[in-house]
Amino acid sequence: CDLPQTHSLGSRRTLMLLAQMRRISLFSCLKDRHDFGFPQEEFGNQFQKAETIPVLHEMIQQIFNLFSTKDSSAAWDETLLDKFYTELYQQLNDLEACVIQGVGVTETPLMKEDSILAVRKYFQRITLYLKEKKYSPCAWEVVRAEIMRSFSLSTNLQESLRSKE
């Protein structure tokens, strides 16, 4: 399954929107910084394309879920958030098309399930952090920056998979 070129452009637009969403400086939130334990090993180069697509899909689905809550809507600019949803939705569609084509369905299912679980736990930690910090502006900024970094890393993986073909 070949992800369309528009998928890469969409990823870049998503990162750009995340950057534009910034309301306060991360530098002002030093005391609120947290290591969420991004499961980088689940996005390692040892993965085959077939194994990464469901993990990437899970990552984007979780980002969508995180930013489509009531608390998120109150924290971010509505226009930017709507554009952000649209980009994520398009990427989910692209990845779902690959999953439907049966890519990797029979390959290392346990490995994939473990990876998807690791991504879910990562987002659970983020959600718990926001709750503990009472969804403060600094907590949301720390999370926005974290999602930018982790999404960027997963985007880099997509690019490296594309270049290996």
Epitope: L30, R33, E146, M148
Partner: antibody, heavy 120, light 107 residues
């Protein structure tokens, strides 16, 4: 084009004072945190201090706390480091650096450095 | 304070070699880790930010990986202009701290 230009080299006696300045151009100065980093001759890099874009938040290394003060004048696009009670161990090349905080915190642009020598 | 250690402290390599430098933090710092290159008499130059992001204009032979406490800078094929000293920097907490540096020289 982003440019950071530190003031000229200085020689001071122990116990003396000095103010370093760093003139910034090519970007919206007030939107960025700024930092000072130093390097003693033949040694590694040491972070000294940082200041938020508005100037409201400042941070210092323990080695300079209480002696050095970081400040900025956003109307003049200039960063400062006021150095008091200078010691021989403050002898170093001092760099000013811009802090990018869009997704992480990193010093993306640096000045050319200015040598401060503290000697009797 | 967060301590940063780097290994090796120096290495000799030839043009075309694959070079790996590691940096370890004394506590978890997420991906708040940056890599710099410095040549004698020059200001440091940002290579990698947020552990794995290549700074604009930096050749793709440089790459970074890691999160938490262990990080790696890799130069896939060493070029003549890459002989320099490399530093890691954590910006998770103040005081921000640099690693002691790794000097890469010609074998």
């Amino acid at each position: 084009e982003v440019q950071l230009l530190e003031s000229g080299a200085e020689v001071k006696k122990p116990g003396g004072s000095l103010r370093l300045s760093c003139a910034a151009s090519g970007f919206t100065f007030s939107s960025y945190a700024m930092s000072w980093v130093r390097q003693a001759p033949g040694k590694g890099l040491e972070w000294v201090s940082a200041i938020s874009g508005s100037g409201g938040s400042t941070y210092y290394a323990d080695s300079v706390k209480g002696r050095f003060t970081i400040s900025r004048d956003n109307s003049k696009n200039t960063l400062y480091l006021q150095m008091n009670s200078l010691r021989a161990e403050d002898t170093a090349v001092y760099y000013c650096a811009r802090v990018d905080s869009s997704s992480s915190l990193h010093f993306d642009y640096w000045g050319q450095g200015t040598l401060v020598t503290v000697s009797s | 304070d967060i301590q940063m250690t780097q290994s090796p402290s120096s290495l000799s390599a030839s043009v075309g070699d694959r070079v790996t430098i590691t940096c370890r933090a004394s506590q978890r710092i997420g991906t708040y880790l940056n890599w710099y290159q410095q040549k004698p008499g020059k200001a440091p130059k940002l290579l990698i930010y947020a552990a794995s992001n290549l700074q604009s204009g930096v050749p793709s032979r440089f790459s970074g990986s890691g999160s938490g406490t262990d990080f790696t800078l890799t130069i896939s094929s060493l070029q003549p202009e890459d002989f320099a000293t490399y530093y890691c920097l954590q910006t998770f907490n103040t005081p921000f701290t640099f690693g002691p540096g790794t000097k890469v020289d010609i074998k």
